[in-house]
Interface confidence: low
C-alpha cells in the first residue's frame, strides 16, 4: 500500500573537525521509495558537487572534508507523491583546533607609549588566548591587558616590559603557539648628572661631568658658547646603558658649556641638554698688581729661546703657574707653525719672553717687560704680514680664547729702553744692525712707528713680558 514518507531518524547536530568527515543521516520509511533532497542554509546541495557524497538512496549525506565555511543548517526533504513532503533539519558545528591567523610581530616602542602585539585566532570552540613573557605566563594588570581579539595591549610601556613574548591559543581540541617575538623598549635620552658650574681662577683646570642614559645608549657632545668643543680632553665610558662623559678644560675665559645627549629612534632623534657656566674669579684679564714669584724655567717649549737657568716670573693668579704658562705658550706656539721662516724665530722669542717674563727678585718679585723696541721689531719687520692678519682676526673675534692676547703684547704699552734701560728686557735673538734690514720682507707701513735702534746683544737678559701689560 502506498505510504507517505516518515523520517524515522531526525537529523541531529553534528560536530566535526576541519578536514575530517561529517555525515548526516536521514532515515525515511515510505512506499513507493521517496526522492530525498538536501539543502544547506536553504540552498539545494547539487548531486554532482564533489565535496559531498550522497548514498543509501539519498539517506546519507557525507561532507568529505569539512571546511570552516561548512557551518550551517542542513535539511533533508523526502517526497514520494503520497501525502506531503517531510523535512528534518540539523546543524553542523565545525569544530576547529586553535589556529593563530595573525601572529604577533617584533615591536620597537618608545617608553611611555602604548604597545599592541596582535594575536588573532580561529577555532571552535573559540580559543582562549594567553601570553607568555620569557619563560612565564604573563599576568594582566592595570597596564597590561589581553584584548577580546587576543591582542596584548600594554599602556605606558616601561623598560621592564622589554623581552620575548608569544601568544598561546587554547581550546578543548588543542593548543597553538605563536612564534616568539621581541618587544624592544626604547628610552629617550635623559641626563642623569648635569655638569656643575664653576667659578675658578684664570688658568685653572676644570673637569665637567655629564652622565646620560637611554636605549639605545646616547652619544654625548659638548658645546662651548654655541660651538662644538674641539679643544679640551673628552673621556667617555659606557656601563649598563649609562654613558659618562668628562670634558677637561683649561680655563682662559668665561663660557657656557652644554652637554647634549642624543639617541636615535628609527629616523627620529631624542636629545637632552644640560648646561654649566664657567666664570673666572675677578675676571678683568690679568691685572697690573699680579703677584708671583721668581723661579728657574723648567719647561720644555721655551728651552731653546730662554737663557739657560733663566729666572722667570711665575704668576700666582694661575692655580698652577708653571703648568698654566707653559700651556699658554704651547697653544700660541702651535699657531706659529703656519708663519714664515723669517717670522717664526722672532715670534717664538717674543712669545716665550712675553709669557715667561724675566723676573727681578726682591722683597716683591717683579716681572720685567720686553722693551718696546724689540716688540716693534717683531711686529713691523720680522712678522709684519702675520701681525696684520692676527690683529684682523682678533677684531673679527675669530679666536676661540683669550690665549692669543697673552702671547701678543701691545707694543705701544711697553716701556722704551730709552726711558730706563733697566726697566725692560731685551731679546738677544733679535741682535742685528740696521744694515741687515734690507734682507727682510717689505714693511707694511711706509715707516716704522718708532725708530728701531741697533739692538745690543745681551747674554744676561732673558726675555719676559708680563701678562700685566699684554692685554688690551
Amino acid at each position: 500500500l502506498p505510504k507517505a514518507p516518515v523520517i524515522t531518524t531526525p537529523l541531529e547536530t553534528v560536530d566535526a573537525l576541519v578536514e575530517e568527515v561529517a555525515t548526516f543521516m536521514c532515515a525515511v520509511e515510505s512506499y513507493p521509495q521517496p526522492e530525498i533532497s538536501w539543502t544547506r542554509n536553504k540552498i539545494l546541495i547539487k548531486l554532482f558537487d564533489t565535496r559531498y557524497s550522497i548514498r543509501e538512496n539519498g539517506q546519507l549525506l557525507t561532507i568529505l572534508s569539512v571546511e570552516d565555511s561548512d557551518d550551517g543548517i542542513y535539511c533533508c526533504t523526502a517526497n514520494n507523491g503520497v501525502g506531503g513532503a517531510v523535512e528534518s533539519c540539523g546543524a553542523l558545528q565545525v569544530k576547529m583546533k586553535p589556529k593563530i591567523t595573525r601572529p604577533p610581530i617584533n615591536v620597537k616602542i618608545i617608553e611611555g607609549l602604548k604597545a599592541v602585539l596582535p594575536c588573532t585566532t580561529m577555532g571552535n570552540p573559540k580559543p582562549s588566548v594567553s601570553w607568555i613573557k620569557g619563560d612565564s605566563p604573563l599576568r594582566e594588570n592595570s597596564r597590561i591587558a589581553v584584548l577580546e581579539s587576543g591582542s596584548l595591549r600594554i599602556h605606558n610601556v616601561q623598560k621592564e616590559d622589554a623581552g620575548q613574548y608569544r601568544c598561546v591559543a587554547k581550546n578543548s581540541l588543542g593548543t597553538a603557539y605563536s612564534k616568539v617575538v621581541k618587544l624592544e623598549v626604547e628610552v629617550f635620552a635623559r641626563i642623569l648628572r648635569a655638569p656643575e658650574s664653576h667659578n675658578v681662577t684664570f688658568g685653572s683646570f676644570v673637569t665637567l661631568h655629564c652622565t646620560a642614559t637611554g636605549i639605545p645608549v646616547p652619544t654625548i657632545t659638548w658645546i662651548e658658547n654655541g660651538n662644538a668643543v674641539s679643544s679640551g680632553s673628552i673621556q667617555e665610558s659606557v656601563k649598563d646603558r649609562v654613558i659618562d662623559s668628562r670634558l677637561q678644560l683649561f680655563i682662559t675665559k668665561p663660557g657656557l658649556y652644554t652637554c647634549i645627549a642624543t639617541n636615535k629612534h628609527g629616523e627620529k632623534f631624542s636629545t637632552a641638554k644640560a648646561a654649566a657656566t664657567i666664570s673666572i674669579a675677578e675676571w678683568s684679564k690679568p691685572q697690573k698688581d699680579n703677584k708671583g714669584y721668581c723661579a728657574q724655567y723648567r719647561g720644555e717649549v721655551c728651552n731653546a729661546v730662554l737663557a739657560k737657568d733663566a729666572l722667570v716670573f711665575l704668576n700666582t693668579s694661575y692655580a698652577d703657574p708653571e703648568e698654566a704658562q707653559e700651556l699658554l705658550v704651547h697653544t700660541a706656539w702651535n699657531e706659529l707653525k703656519v708663519v714664515s721662516p723669517v717670522c717664526r724665530p722672532a715670534a717664538e722669542a717674543l712669545l716665550c719672553n712675553h709669557i715667561f717674563q724675566e723676573c727681578s727678585p726682591g722683597v716683591v718679585p717683579t716681572p720685567i717687560p720686553i722693551c718696546r723696541e724689540y716688540c716693534l721689531a717683531v711686529k713691523e719687520l720680522f712678522c709684519a704680514k702675520e701681525w696684520l692678519v692676527m690683529e684682523e682676526k682678533t677684531h673679527r673675534g675669530l679666536y676661540r680664547s683669550e690665549m692669543h692676547l697673552l702671547s701678543v703684547p701691545e707694543c705701544s704699552k711697553l716701556p722704551s729702553m730709552h726711558w730706563d734701560p733697566t726697566a725692560c728686557a731685551r731679546l738677544p735673538h733679535l741682535d742685528y744692525n740696521k744694515e741687515n734690514l734690507k734682507t727682510f720682507p717689505p714693511m707694511t707701513s711706509s715707516k716704522p712707528s718708532v725708530d728701531i735702534p741697533n739692538l745690543p746683544s745681551s747674554s744676561s737678559s732673558s726675555f719676559s713680558v708680563s701678562p700685566t701689560y699684554s692685554m688690551t
Epitope: 607568555i132 620569557g134 619563560d135 623581552g163 620575548q164 593548543t175 603557539y177 612564534k179 616568539v180
Partner: antibody, heavy 124, light 108 residues
Framework: EVQLVESGGGLVQPGGSLRLSCAAS????????IHWVRQAPGKGLEWVAS????????YYADSVKGRFTISADTSKNTAYLQMNSLRAEDTAVYYC?????????????????WGQGTLVTVSS | DIQMTQSPSSLSASVGDRVTITCRAS??????VAWYQQKPGKAPKLLIY???SLYSGVPSRFSGSRSGTDFTLTISSLQPEDFATYYC??????????FGQGTKVEIK
C-alpha cells in the same frame, strides 16, 4: 623541515676538553629552548644542560655543573656544549633536542626534535 | 631533586597485548611529564606530552594518564614496531629535566 645535527664528539683523555655543536635548521634557535641529553653505553637517558629561549638563562645537571658550559650563537643557529675536565663517567652519546613550545605553560610539550647523537669517549 | 621511579624496568609481551608502564614522582609535580620511545642506536621519539596528550603522528594505541604522582603510559594493543625502550621524563622547573630509568619492552 626541522633538523638538529650534532658534531664534535670523539676520543679524549680524562681531564681533557671537547666542544660539541648542535646545528639547527628549519626553525630559529632564539625562539626555542635547546637541551643536551646524554646516554652512557647500555644505560638510560640523562639530562645534561639547557639554554632558554632568551639565552639569558642556562641550567645544568649537578653532575656537570662547573665543568660544562652551554651557549648558543643565534647568527649561526647553533648551540654548543663546552665540556672541560672530562671524566670516564662522561663517556656517552650526546644528543641535542628542542623543547617544543615554551616550557610547561600552558602544558609541558616535551622534547619534540632530537639530533642523531655524537659519541664522546673519555679514556686514557 | 624530583626522582622519577619507572617500573617495570623490563617486560615481555606479545603482539596484541595491553601494556602499562608506570612512573612515580618522588614528590608532587605538575602534568609536565612526557613519554619517549627509543630504539637501539636511534634518538628518542616523543610519544606523549603534558602527561596525557598524544604527540602528532603517534598512533592512537598509545595513551597517557595521571593519578596524583603516578603517571602511566598504556599501549592498548602492542604492535611489532612497538618493541623498544620507553622513558618517562618530568620537568619540575622551566629547564630542569629528570628521566625515568627506562622500561624495555621485549617480545615474549
Amino acid at each position: 623541515e626541522v633538523q638538529l645535527v650534532e658534531s664534535g664528539g670523539g676520543l679524549v683523555q680524562p681531564g681533557g676538553s671537547l666542544r660539541l655543536s648542535c646545528a639547527a635548521s628549519g626553525f630559529t634557535l632564539y625562539s626555542s629552548s635547546i637541551h643536551w641529553v646524554r646516554q652512557a653505553p647500555g644505560k638510560g637517558l640523562e639530562w645534561v644542560a639547557s639554554i632558554s629561549s632568551s639565552y639569558s638563562s642556562t641550567y645544568y645537571a649537578d653532575s656537570v655543573k662547573g665543568r660544562f658550559t652551554i651557549s648558543a650563537d643565534t647568527s649561526k643557529n647553533t648551540a654548543y656544549l663546552q665540556m672541560n675536565s672530562l671524566r670516564a663517567e662522561d663517556t656517552a652519546v650526546y644528543y641535542c633536542a628542542r623543547l617544543a613550545g615554551l616550557y610547561h605553560y600552558p602544558g609541558y610539550l616535551g622534547l619534540d626534535y632530537w639530533g642523531q647523537g655524537t659519541l664522546v669517549t673519555v679514556s686514557s | 631533586d624530583i626522582q622519577m621511579t619507572q617500573s617495570p624496568s623490563s617486560l615481555s609481551a606479545s603482539v596484541g597485548d595491553r601494556v602499562t608502564i608506570t612512573c612515580r614522582a618522588s614528590q608532587s609535580v605538575s602534568s609536565a611529564v612526557a613519554w619517549y620511545q627509543q630504539k637501539p642506536g636511534k634518538a628518542p621519539k616523543l610519544l606523549i606530552y603534558s602527561a596525557s596528550s598524544l604527540y602528532s603522528g603517534v598512533p592512537s594505541r598509545f595513551s597517557g594518564s595521571r593519578s596524583g604522582t603516578d603517571f602511566t603510559l598504556t599501549i592498548s594493543s602492542l604492535q611489532p614496531e612497538d618493541f623498544a625502550t620507553y622513558y618517562c621524563q618530568q620537568s619540575s622547573r622551566s629547564s630542569l629535566l629528570t628521566f625515568g630509568q627506562g622500561t624495555k619492552v621485549e617480545i615474549k
